[in-house]
C-alpha cells in the first residue's frame, strides 16, 4: 500500500559537511515498527546511503559505520548526514516503510537536493 512522504526540496550542507532534513510520512495506521532508508540519486544512478529501523518513540538504529544519525518524533524523522564533500552533492531520497503491524505501507519522497561546497583551505600564515 502506498503512503505519502514529504521532505524539503533543498538543503545546503554546513561548512563541516553536515546536512540535516526532516522526512515526514502520513501514517495511515498505528505503526509500531518503521524502516527508513536514505538513497542518493545522481546521474541516474541510485545508491543506498543508509538505512535504519526503529520502534515508535525510540531512537533510530543505524549500522555502526553509517554516516547517518537520526531521531524520530511521531510521524517525523529528523535525519543528519555527515562527512559530506562537494562530490556528494545530489538528490537524497527518503523512503519509509511501515513494517508492523500489517498492512505493510511504503512511501518514497520526492527527494532533497543537498548541495555540498568544500571549504576553501586556509591560506598559510607566515
Amino acid at each position: 500500500k502506498a503512503m505519502h512522504v514529504a521532505q524539503p526540496a533543498v538543503v545546503l550542507a554546513s561548512s563541516r559537511g553536515i546536512a540535516s532534513f526532516v522526512c515526514e510520512y502520513a501514517s495511515p495506521g498505528k505503526a509500531t515498527e518503521v524502516r527508513v532508508t536514505v538513497l542518493r540519486q545522481a546521474d541516474s544512478q541510485v545508491t543506498e546511503v543508509c538505512a535504519a529501523t526503529y520502534m515508535m518513540g525510540n531512537e533510530l538504529t543505524f549500522l555502526d559505520d553509517s554516516i547517518c544519525t537520526g531521531t524520530s518524533s511521531g510521524n517525523q524523522v529528523n535525519l543528519t548526514i555527515q562527512g559530506l564533500r562537494a562530490m556528494d552533492t545530489g538528490l537524497y531520497i527518503c523512503k519509509v516503510e511501515l513494517m508492523y503491524p500489517p498492512p505493510y505501507y511504503l512511501g518514497i519522497g520526492n527527494g532533497t537536493q543537498i548541495y555540498v561546497i568544500d571549504p576553501e583551505p586556509c591560506p598559510d600564515s607566515d
Epitope: A2, L39, V46, I93, K95
Partner: nanobody, 119 residues
C-alpha cells in the same frame, strides 16, 4: 518483461520446514532488493523478509525472526525463504517481490505459493 515465479509451497505439519524459491526471468538485471510477503485469508498483506543487494543485508518481521532465513543467488536471479519451526499462523499465500532500484518501490510481484501448516 520481468517475471517472478515462486515454488516450494505445500502442506506441512506444525514444527516442520519448507523452502520457498522465487526465480526471476525475462532479462539481465540487478535488483536492489528482493523480498517475501504473505497474506492469509481475510487478513492484510504482511511483510515477511527482504534482502538488499548492496550489502546482502537482511531484514525480518518479528513474527518470523529466528525461524525463517532469506537468501539469494545472484547468479541464478533467485531468492529463497527457508522456513523452519512452522506454526499454524504461518498459513498464508506467500508472494515474492522485487524492486529494481531503491526508489522504484516493489516493481514486480509473483503469483504466490500457498503454505498450509496443520496442527
Amino acid at each position: 518483461e520481468v517475471q517472478l515465479v515462486e515454488s516450494g509451497g505445500g502442506v506441512v505439519q506444525a514444527g516442520g520446514s519448507l523452502r520457498l524459491s522465487c526465480a526471476a526471468s525475462g532479462g539481465t538485471f540487478s535488483f536492489y532488493g528482493m523480498g517475501w510477503f504473505r497474506q492469509a485469508p481475510g487478513k492484510e498483506q504482511e511483510f515477511v523478509a527482504d534482502i538488499r543487494t548492496s550489502a546482502g543485508r537482511t531484514y525480518y518481521a518479528d513474527s518470523v525472526k529466528g525461524r525463517f532465513t532469506i537468501s539469494r543467488d545472484n547468479a541464478k536471479n533467485t531468492v529463497y525463504l527457508q522456513m523452519n519451526s512452522l506454526k499454524p499462523e504461518d498459513t498464508a499465500l506467500y508472494y515474492c517481490a522485487a524492486e529494481m532500484s531503491g526508489i522504484s518501490g516493489w516493481d514486480y510481484w509473483g503469483q504466490g505459493t500457498q503454505v498450509t501448516v496443520s496442527s
